[in-house]
């Protein structure tokens, strides 16, 4: 015997209270597949979330984050505050990267400048809060009289972090 509920299309539910008749999903609910015995409540995009796609009877609402925040998690389930490049997010807000560290993203944390000398190279361009140093040729490769800039970059061996 075929389940009568299997005939209920997406956007409806099989209403046990009405002799298993297919009833439309109530307002603010949806069913994305057929044969459902209940409709799911639509996601509401509130607070730092904003609506990217409205809920319909057959599909859930989709949210993204308001400007100044970025999405984390499946389906943008979380919003985290942006900072500027050259900063990192702490509980007290966005803080500038400490000297010798940088962050080239609006999210995430600062990390140390590359230590060019670990690869036997010299610093071609100094690092900033927003950008890593640029390493150039090894000092021995430089022509006589050429000089290289060597800022006091912190070591960047694996596992080392600035304190």
């Amino acid at each position: 015997l075929q389940d009568p509920c299997s005939n209920c299309p997406a956007g409806t539910f099989c209403d046990n209270n009405r002799n298993q008749i297919c009833s439309p999903c109530p307002p603010n609910s949806f069913s994305s597949a057929g044969g459902q015995r209940t409709c799911d409540i639509c996601r509401q995009c509130k607070g730092v979330f904003r609506t990217r796609k409205e809920c319909s009877s057959t599909s859930n609402a989709e949210c993204d984050c308001t400007p100044g925040f970025h999405c984390l998690g499946a389906g943008c389930s979380m919003c985290e505050q942006d900072c500027k490049q050259g900063q990192e997010l702490t509980k007290k807000g966005c803080k500038d990267c400490c000297f010798g560290t940088f962050n080239d993203q609006k999210r995430g944390i600062c990390r140390p400048w590359t230590n060019c000398s670990l690869d036997g190279k010299s610093v071609l361009v100094n690092g900033t809060k927003e950008r890593d140093v640029v390493c150039g040729p090894s000092p021995a490769d430089l022509s006589p009289g050429a000089s290289s800039v060597t800022p006091p970059a912190p070591a960047r061996e694996p596992g080392h972090s600035p304190q």
């Epitope: 984390l72 998690g73 499946a74 389930s77 979380m78 985290e80 702490t90 509980k91 993203q105 995430g108 944390i109 990390r111 140390p112 590359t114 890593d132 960047r156 694996p158 596992g159 972090s161 304190q163």
Partner: antibody
Framework: QVQLVQSGAEVKKPGESLKISCKGS????????ISWVRQMPGKGLEWMGK????????NYSPSFQGQVTISADKSISTAYLQWSSLKASDTAMYYC?????????WGQGTLVTVSS | DIELTQPPSVSVAPGQTARISCSGD??????AHWYQQKPGQAPVVVIY???NRPSGIPERFSGSNSGNTATLTISGTQAEDEADYYC???????????FGGGTKLTVL
Amino acid sequence: QVQLVQSGAEVKKPGESLKISCKGSGYSFSTYWISWVRQMPGKGLEWMGKIYPGDSYTNYSPSFQGQVTISADKSISTAYLQWSSLKASDTAMYYCARGYGIFDYWGQGTLVTVSS
Amino acid sequence: DIELTQPPSVSVAPGQTARISCSGDNIGDQYAHWYQQKPGQAPVVVIYQDKNRPSGIPERFSGSNSGNTATLTISGTQAEDEADYYCSTYTFVGFTTVFGGGTKLTVL
């Protein structure tokens, strides 16, 4: 959609080496930290360390510093966790997770069994 | 590094309120996050940045964090909430993440 897919279960002998992997897809792999988390049988979660695949900068928990090596190949969106000489006490489930503070996506886990 | 201490187990009757504590020196100065892990599954965020609930997580989950204690509260606990719960924090001293030891929540 974002996915982290880990390599399959491993059975090894003490003293052997091992490298397990975590392949990311559906996002800009280079610009998000990847962390590794250990869970020994019946025990809790332990953060091991993290890597920024964009430039392979790593940072380890003091408990795991020198015990494992974390690396990444951004060209194939893959992070690695490796041991040069396994011990029986390395038997555990190992998870990779995206992030450094909030871990929003997790791999399915790689079970590593070390037994003679 | 900061050490986070959780009770190994908490039991609660269905419909009652469960509170899981996570204590650590000045944890209130850092964001606390909470993960739920069910057997054979990877952990899932249930609370992030002290008190924020990801979409898809029921409203009965809430969090707070101040002083030396972060707390996960589950109001009107349901059988499906039975799981292991872990707190975690990222510390800018040492640049490491730390997990609490975990709490097994049993719904009686």
